[in-house]
């Protein structure tokens, strides 16, 4: 009885676990356990695609790179058709590549939550991370993710990270920029005139603030009056009356921050 069949194959790999480090060598051997009729061609496939110029029963991979990780098998054909071996999963291990940081979300509004993710290709996966804010290490932050539940203005800046696995430590990538937006801070209404203010005087007030992001674009004043604003953040009250008791200003960007009112204490002329 002459039963024709495609080649039956066995694949062997050195090292046997098919786990190697970048720069190591790997040898795969294809053995034909039976073939009827006799086999005619041999080829090797990686991730289902045929490898060019690999037509012998031994596949030698010298100084492997991480790109050579994948599923390998050999294919041997006879007149009946092709036979394929089982797949061998070759894992090329390497130290982490330079990392990148992803920020969810920037710009962030003060008080909102922000999450940072450190991304670095590595095999095996990184086991430890070091985080930096404006080049300074963030103590205790050793995980892939950093979660800040309520962001503050001074959290703004460049975040970078370094990933580490058993093969080594990666390099710090360029990092990502966090922009934190917030209302104007420490707004004050300042009376520019010498005291005391007398009825009929011209009073100049300025609206000052400590910092803001984005920049202050306008100012508001309470109470509203037919007063002159000679420049941004400056109010001029001509011929002040004794009933002009208190004035407050607000500095505004995307939000308005109000100062505490100031008393003019206008004295009778």
């Amino acid at each position: 009885l002459n039963v024709k069949h495609t080649p039956k194959l066995e694949i062997k790999v050195t090292p046997s676990d098919a786990i190697v480090r970048e720069g190591d060598s790997v040898t795969m051997t294809c053995e034909v356990s039976s073939s009827n009729p006799e086999y005619t061609t041999v080829s090797w496939l990686k991730d289902g695609t045929s490898l060019k110029k690999q037509n012998t029963f031994t596949l030698n991979l010298r100084e492997v790179t991480k790109d050579q990780s994948g599923k390998y098998c050999c294919q041997v054909s006879n007149d009946v058709g092709p036979g394929r071996s089982e797949e061998v999963f070759l894992q090329v291990q390497y130290a982490p590549e330079p990392s990148t940081v992803q920020i969810l979300h920037s710009p962030a509004v003060e008080g909102s939550q922000v999450e940072f993710l450190c991304m670095s290709l590595a095999n095996p996966l990184p086991t430890n991370y070091t985080w930096y804010h404006n080049g300074k290490e963030m103590q205790g932050r050793t995980e892939e993710k950093v979660h800040i539940p309520k962001i503050l203005p001074w959290h703004a800046g460049t975040y970078s990270c370094v990933a580490e696995n058993i093969l080594g430590t990666g390099q710090r990538g360029p990092g990502a920029e966090l922009d934190v937006q917030y209302p104007p801070k420490k707004v004050t209404t300042v009376i520019q005139n010498p005291m005391p203010i007398r009825e009929g005087d011209t009073v100049t007030l300025s609206c000052n603030y400590n910092s803001s992001n984005p920049s202050v674009t306008r100012y508001e004043w309470k109470p509203h009056g037919a007063w002159e604003e000679p420049s941004l953040g400056v109010l001029k009250i001509q011929n002040v009356g004794w009933d002009n008791t208190t004035i407050a200003c607000a500095a505004c960007n995307s939000w308005c921050s109000w100062a505490s009112p100031v008393a003019l204490n206008v004295q009778y002329a």
Epitope: Q139, G140, R141, K145, V146, H147, I148, K150
Partner: antibody
């Protein structure tokens, strides 16, 4: 020196509203990065977080009690308040308030200083 | 909610002995973990924050370690004043949750 002190009614009846006050000193709830949290502990049992209030008036509640809790603050007198509606005997516990501070070394928020606690008994 | 499972529930140790308490989170908490000590009739006191950072004024015999979901508190050389309840607490996700506590007694 940071201190917090809780005050409350001591005893109240089921279905009533529990009102608690946390009076603090040594920090301001108008400072960025500051918060106050409420935590309770039934006698001989573990701790249960209830709610937080932050410098920007943001509030967080424990979902298991959310529809019964209201947290508020008055920054001008350095006080935080907690109201629990429709109390039951299961609300009998020691209630603590704690400062939540931003720790600059790793950007953590930590309940770092706690009040002495106030005992609340719900009984008919 | 993230569940915090603390073990053991109780233990007794001799003076000078090294003691470890474990805390297992039901999900990753990125080192957002604190340890508190609560002496009888008193309020909790912060010992460790950020999993391993020692709070100012806390004796150096206390140390914290761990990452991901597994964390531990170690007391290197038990002292009589360490007799207390110990709690872990995560602040990674709302609601904040505490471990069930560990009662540490002096042998």
């Amino acid at each position: 020196q940071v201190t917090l002190k809780e005050s409350g009614p001591g005893i109240l009846q089921p279905s009533q509203t529990l009102s608690l006050t946390c009076t603090f000193s040594g920090f301001s709830l108008s400072t960025s990065g500051m918060g106050v949290g409420w935590i309770r502990q039934p006698s001989g049992k573990g701790l249960e977080w209830l709610t937080n209030i932050w410098w920007d008036d943001d509030k967080n509640y424990n979902p298991s009690l959310k529809n019964r809790l209201t947290i508020s603050k008055d920054t001008s007198i350095n006080q935080a308040f907690l109201k629990i509606t429709n109390v039951d005997t299961a609300d009998t516990a020691t209630y603590y308030c704690a400062r939540i501070a931003h720790y600059f070394d790793g950007y953590y928020y930590v309940m770092d200083v706690w009040g002495q606690g106030t005992s609340v008994t719900v009984s008919s | 909610d993230i569940q915090m499972t603390q073990s053991p529930a109780s233990l007794s140790a001799s003076l000078g002995e090294t003691v470890s308490i474990e805390c297992l989170a039901s999900g990753g908490i990125s080192n957002d973990l604190a340890w508190y000590q609560q002496k009888s009739g008193k309020s909790p006191q912060l010992l460790i924050y950020a999993a391993s950072r020692l709070q100012d004024g806390v004796p150096s015999r206390f140390s914290g370690s761990g990452s991901g979901t597994r964390y531990s508190l170690k007391i290197s050389g038990m002292q009589s004043e360490d007799e207390a309840d110990y709690f872990c607490q995560q602040s990674y996700k709302y609601p904040y949750t505490f471990g069930g506590g560990t009662k540490l007694e002096l042998k």
